[in-house]
Interface confidence: low
């Protein structure tokens, strides 16, 4: 941040916020937030990792091929093109100008976000972007829009990263076909630092008896504004190619009812290939409580797509017109037509026909809500809130919100408290079976709506017409499952914020992450599964998965977790420790023998006492080391990345519209 | 598309049905509604019928003058006109409707003559 | 019912002029209004709907106007081929109801 470029409002709210004197000249007040600045100013050797997340490195522009590689080996080498990482909004400002910082902890923060000032309905001051300041998501209000931008969609203006230390560096390092998700979740792994317990989420008080964006019943990396009727999905690296969700607070099992959803903005994803289908979509419609957020692709879900086509159970069949940015959708079920429901939808007033007839029998009297599910696009609803509606409304419906209270349904209620949530570690090898197990543990307990946190959930969430991105896809498959072990990182961080229970579904073998990945849960239920088959059917089920899926995790990667397993403890970061196949004498005995295994193996082929320090702040511009975290580089430079941060190429090829 | 029967020459005090094809798209999802144009004046809605329920809706002004009935089989919408008078002589529409009440697209019409 | 006045009743114009045409509703009908274009012998076609929105393929010379009571349909940069009677229409409340029509025709 560049205190001198601040207007005086601006260091007094900075000041404020740091809990510091907010009287003075502009001066003195310049001086006093320079001061705060330089003493949050981490150390030289603080390690900013794939969890850190500070943001975009100072000198890369979206447009602009990065300069300055490592001298450690070879020529700089830059990410591949396209995959530049870029800042992510600090937030979202709802009316009141205010963030809601889901999802960066106070201390994590490298950069500030300033509030637009509104100029007039088509469109917002601008403040000139500077090379530096890496533009985060704001939604673009044209003027071409056909109504007025909505007063309460004023996002964050840019973030303004910190200077020094933000080198954009990468190192080379052999290209390896077969690097799965459980490759890059072992090397993430191996790493150690210990982050702060999170700030805790800010507690709105909303009235809870409106129909709004539910925040319990939503994608983690859905971000919904405060006041509870606009949202946008994260968009920066990998988690441009998920699918984001949300789930209204009411629904309804009766009467003729209607929402509008507009799309706002079709936010910019520069940094996804040309070659993705459909980098920009809505699909917009109905679903139960007890879906998924992935509307359409499930029985009991219904949605009507940009791409002009309606799914349900991940049928797609063409239906009405293709939509996008500026659009408004009415969706309407009218429960009154017999012993079915109809579904429809208009766009922008004009009526697309009946999209789905639901036996009422089948849905055995459950509510439906309403349900948004949103690829890099920035949303808002209308529930009935808007004193006019956006559009031409089906004569006979009325508006969700519109309905009395003891007419509509409300959607699951979230925990009150940390305390009722729980946190389910994974514990083992991969191909154990954990992703079964979370699943199934996940089914049998519906009332829990567990979030799944791990690389197989969010490569679900990168789907194609409701099929899976397989690995004839025609990108860098490893790239892929690298930016989804990105996604996975952030998404713990902003789920240790938010009251849910959730199942990290990950190898978790090593002690170190056991402990590291557990500590910003305090206060949580903190469990550990421990999935440990026989070695016998460990080896049965990795050929399984290999046969299914191609070659995961590589042998040398899966030695070094078997030398490093640690079976946890109940203890400072974990209230239980449950075994579901071995036991835990049984399951002592196979880890130890895996211990020996490990390490008569030896190290791993490729640089694994490499600590030569370099590569840029870890997992930002490349390679880096693949080496221990025990023995760390010099002082003078951050480690090498985990992962080459910039990624690959990514992107769609052979599939069908999105 | 939406095709409409040929044109009608009636005596007062007889009733007609005229017939409405509905071709290229699936017959029960849109709904069909009916107007009246009488000659050199403006378009009056006469009605709607839901062809998936058979379901209507009159104008009140028409009820009891004009039936509408589907044939879902043969994609077919009808209207029978009872008790003409020269009142009655005009062009009827068809029309392929949004639940909104908009006309998004239209037969080619039908001329109904009552004449003694 | 809701009445729907449309003005003017006649209206001449040139191949090249700008020309507009207002239908008042008895009511608040909201954004709910249509226009359509009818040609002599033919039947009527779906200009704008909610107002503002074309239908498509209608060139974008012709534009929709006016929430409320007040809605303008405005023809900029006439065409032979706009020569024709035009309707507005309601659609917020059942019955369904017209204006009496403009016809367009030239000088």
């Known amino acids: 941040m560049d205190v001198r470029r601040l207007k005086v409002n601006e260091l007094r709210e900075e000041l404020q916020r740091r809990g510091l004197d907010t009287r003075g000249l502009k001066a003195e007040l310049a001086e006093r937030l320079q001061a705060a600045l330089e003493a949050e100013e981490p150390d030289d050797e603080r390690e900013l990792d794939a969890d850190d997340e500070p943001g975009r490195p100072g000198h890369i522009n979206e447009e602009v091929e990065t300069e300055g590689g490592s001298e450690l080996e070879g020529t700089a080498q830059p990410p591949p093109p396209g995959l530049q990482p870029h800042a992510e909004p600090g937030g979202y400002s709802g009316p009141d100008g205010h963030y809601a910082m889901d999802n960066i902890t106070r201390q994590n923060q490298f950069y500030d976000t300033q509030v637009i000032k509104q100029e007039n309905e088509s469109g917002y001051e601008r403040r000139p972007l500077e090379m530096e300041q890496q533009q985060a998501y704001r939604p673009e209000m044209k003027t071409e829009m056909k109504q007025g931008a909505p007063t309460s969609f004023l996002p964050p203006e840019a973030s303004q990263l910190k200077p020094d230390r933000q080198q954009f560096q990468s190192r080379k390092r052999p290209y390896e076909e077969n690097r799965g998700r459980g490759y890059f979740e072992h090397r993430e792994d191996r790493r150690g630092r210990s982050p702060q317990p999170p700030a805790e989420e800010d507690e709105d008080d909303f009235d809870d008896t409106l129909v709004a964006i539910d925040t319990y019943n939503c994608d983690l990396h859905f971000k919904v504004a405060r006041d509870r009727s606009s949202g946008y999905p994260l968009t920066i690296e990998g988690f441009a190619y998920l699918w984001s969700g949300a789930r209204a607070s009411y629904g309804v099992r009766r009467g003729r009812v209607c929402f509008e959803m507009k799309i706002n903005e079709e936010i910019s994803v520069k940094h996804l290939p040309s070659t993705e289908p459909d980098p920009h979509v809505v699909r917009i419609g109905w679903s139960l409580d007890s879906c998924s957020t992935q509307l359409g692709e499930e029985p009991f879900s219904y949605g009507y797509g940009g791409t002009g086509k309606k799914s349900t159970n991940s049928r797609f069949e063409n239906y009405g017109d293709k939509f996008a940015e500026n659009d408004v959708i009415g969706c309407f079920a009218d429960f009154e037509c017999g012993n079915d429901v109809e579904l429809s939808f208009t766009k922008n007033g004009k009526w697309m026909g009946i999209a789905f007839r639901i036996q009422k029998e089948a849905l055995g009297g459950q509510a439906l809500y309403p349900h948004v599910l949103v690829k890099n696009c920035a949303v808002e609803f209308n529930f009935g809130q808007r004193a006019e509606p956006y559009c031409s409304v089906l004569p006979g419906f009325t508006f969700i919100q519109h309905l009395p209270l003891s007419e509509r349904i409300r959607g699951t209620v979230g925990p009150k408290s940390k305390a009722e949530c729980e946190i389910l570690m994974m514990v083992g090898l991969p191909a154990a079976g954990k992703t079964t197990w979370a699943i199934k543990h996940a089914a049998s307990n519906p009332s829990k709506k567990y979030n799944i946190l791990g690389t197989n959930a969010i490569m679900d969430k990168m789907r194609v017409m409701g099929l899976r991105r397989q690995r004839n896809y025609a990108g860098r498959w490893d790239v892929l499952i690298q930016q989804a072990t990105q996604c996975l990182n952030r998404l713990i961080q902003i789920a240790a914020r938010k009251k849910r229970n959730y199942i990290l579904d990950q190898t978790n073998v090593y002690g170190s992450a056991q402990r590291r990945k557990m500590r910003p849960f305090e206060g949580f239920q903190r469990k550990a599964i421990v999935i440990c088959p026989t070695d016998e059917d460990l080896k049965d089920r990795t050929i399984k998965r290999t046969d299914e899926e191609g070659k995961d995790v590589p042998d040398h990667a899966v030695l070094e977790m078997k030398a490093n397993f640690t079976l946890p403890d109940v203890g400072d970061f974990l209230d239980e420790v449950l075994f579901i196949e071995l036991q835990r004498e049984e399951a002592d005995k196979l880890v130890r023998q895996y211990n020996e295994e490990g390490r008569k193996a030896g190290p791993p082929p490729e640089k694994r006492f490499d600590n030569r320090g370099g590569g840029g702040f870890r997992g930002r511009g490349g390679g880096g080391g693949f080496q221990r975290y025990e023995n760390r580089g010099p002082p003078g430079g951050n480690r090498g990345g985990f992962q080459n941060r910039g990624g690959g190429s990514g992107g769609g090829g052979n599939y069908r519209g999105g | 598309q939406l095709q409409e029967s040929g044109p009608e020459l009636v005596k007062p005090g007889a009733s007609v049905k005229i017939s409405c094809k509905a071709s290229?798209?699936?017959?029960?999802?849109?709904?069909i509604l009916w107007v009246k144009q009488s000659h050199g004046k403006s378009l009056e809605w006469i009605g709607n019928?839901?062809?998936?329920?058979?379901?209507?809706t009159y104008n009140l002004k028409f009820k009891g003058k004009a039936t509408l009935t589907v044939d879902k089989s043969s994609s077919t919408a009808y209207m029978q006109l009872n008790s003409l008078t020269s009142e009655d002589s005009a062009v009827y529409y068809c029309?392929?409707?949004?639940?909104?009440?908009?006309?998004?697209?239209w037969g080619q019409g039908t001329l109904v003559t009552v004449s003694a | 019912d809701i009445v729907m006045t449309q003005t003017p009743k006649f209206m001449s114009t040139s191949v090249g002029d700008r020309v507009s045409v207002t239908c008042k509703a008895s009511?608040?009908?909201?954004?709910?209004v249509a226009w359509y274009q009818q040609k002599p012998g033919q039947s009527p076609k779906e200009l704008i709907y909610?107002?503002?929105y074309r239908y498509s393929g209608v060139p974008d010379r012709f534009t929709g106007s006016g929430s409320g009571t007040d809605f303008t349909l405005t023809i900029s940069n006439v065409q032979s081929e706009d020569l024709a009677e035009y309707f507005c229409?309601?659609?917020?409340?059942?019955?369904?109801?017209f204006g009496a029509g403009t016809k367009l025709e030239l000088q």
């Open positions: 029309a392929r409707g949004d639940l909104t009440g908009t006309f998004a697209y």
């Open positions: 290229g798209y699936s017959f029960t999802d849109y709904i």
């Open positions: 019928i839901n062809p998936y329920y058979g379901s209507t």
């Open positions: 009511q608040n009908v909201g954004t709910y």
């Open positions: 909610s107002a503002s």
């Open positions: 229409q309601q659609f917020n409340s059942y019955p369904l109801t």
